[in-house]
């Protein structure tokens, strides 16, 4: 059903605009400084302007992040925006393009040439509104991690899912993020009922694997108090 379409916490598949645009919930896509938007009859072509609404970074492509396109914009209205290249300003790791991470507000290279052996990496994790580091849930923690040429194996520290090997995703574990297995059929999954509720998990599960969706387990023998258990199921 469209539960997986409209009630899941995963949005994807839309080439973002150049810069992207979104207004308030139910509002028009409107202009903001430094970003290309449609105004009046002046729309971008289909290849350039396909705003994709999102709730979290995982719902966008690997070269994108999810945020409000306007500075100080409504956090509840976000779209997929193009990732930021090296030396561009950032607030969190996901804003930086693959191969980079956010350090002191600037996207810097995470290339092996720049980091050898063990490095001290400061990771800022935000909870609630995942794109802001100014909320009450922000926490800084210093992690000792190794930068590898190969993709991260299970348990490896990561910044984003693209850092992890096939079959793994980057998910929170306490105050850091590590590579965890993508969920298989029958495994318990987390169905986010509220936008942003994923930000409160300190032991975050991966999403269900391809061809699976997180749905209520239909087991008539279950007690009523556990009837809301969700598992990865095929369609």
């Amino acid at each position: 059903t469209l539960n997986s379409v409209l009630n899941s916490n995963a949005i994807k598949n839309l080439p973002p605009p150049l810069g992207g645009a979104a207004g308030h919930p139910g509002s028009a896509v409107s202009a903001a400084p430094g970003i290309l938007y449609p105004g009046g009859n002046k729309y971008q072509t289909i290849d350039n302007y396909q705003p994709y609404p999102c709730a979290e970074d995982e719902e966008c492509g690997t070269d994108e992040y999810c945020a409000s396109p306007t500075r100080g914009g409504d956090a509840g209205v976000q779209i997929c925006l193009a990732c930021r290249k090296r030396r561009k300003r950032c607030m969190r790791h996901a804003m930086c393009c693959p191969g980079n991470y956010c350090k002191n507000g600037i996207c810097v290279s995470s290339d092996q040439n720049h980091f050898r052996g063990e490095i001290e990496e400061t990771i800022t994790e935000s909870f609630g509104n995942d794109h802001s580091t100014l909320d009450g849930y922000s926490r800084r923690t210093t992690l000792s991690s190794k930068m590898y040429h190969t993709k991260g194996q299970e348990g490896s520290v990561c910044l984003r899912s693209s850092d992890c090997a096939s079959g793994l995703c980057c998910a929170r574990h306490f105050w850091s993020k590590i590579c965890k297995p993508v969920l298989k059929e029958g495994q318990v999954c987390t169905k986010h009922r509220r936008k942003g509720s994923h930000g409160l998990e300190i032991f975050q599960r991966c999403y269900c694997g391809e061809g699976l969706s997180c749905r209520i387990q239909k087991d008539h023998h279950q007690a009523s108090n556990s009837s809301r258990l969700h598992t990865c199921q095929r369609h």
Epitope: L2, V5, I11, G76
Partner: nanobody, 124 residues
Framework: EVQLVESGGGLVQPGGSLRLSCAAS????????MGWFRQAPGKEREFVAA????????IYADSVKGRFTISADNSKNTAYLQMNSLKPEDTAVYYC?????????????????WGQGTLVTVSS
């Protein structure tokens, strides 16, 4: 692959209303956003409206704000575009779009799959 079939288009007078429907089938478990785009004769295809999966966020183009409403019915795997106060300039082929893929499946950009379109003509 996702299949999208639009319906509800037709001829309507200025000021009138139409409700477009988009039935999704196939790999719908991968869909996480739905949108509507349109293409008028001799013009580029343009964004109209979109709705997110997680928060039910809806966004609209300036030209349709306050007149069009995007929604979806989970039980019917269908998205809708309610179009009120139609104007002649709204005349176009309207395409349903399903957001399918993204970071979860290694896509560099989130992207839409497209339906074949349904023609809306606003004329007196």
């Amino acid at each position: 692959e996702v299949q999208l079939v639009e319906s509800g288009g037709g001829l309507v007078q200025p000021g009138g209303s139409l409700r477009l429907s988009c039935a999704a089938s196939g790999s719908i478990e991968n869909i996480n956003a739905m949108g509507w785009f349109r293409q008028a004769p001799g013009k580029e295809r343009e964004f109209v409206a979109a709705i997110s999966s997680g928060g039910g966020i809806t966004i609209y183009a300036d030209s349709v704000k306050g007149r069009f409403t995007i929604s979806a019915d989970n039980s019917k795997n269908t998205a809708y575009l309610q179009m009120n106060s139609l104007k002649p300039e709204d005349t176009a082929v309207y395409y349903c779009a399903a957001g399918n893929g993204g970071r979860k499946y290694g896509h560099h950009r989130a992207r839409y799959d497209w339906g074949q379109g349904t023609l809306v003509t606003v004329s007196s």
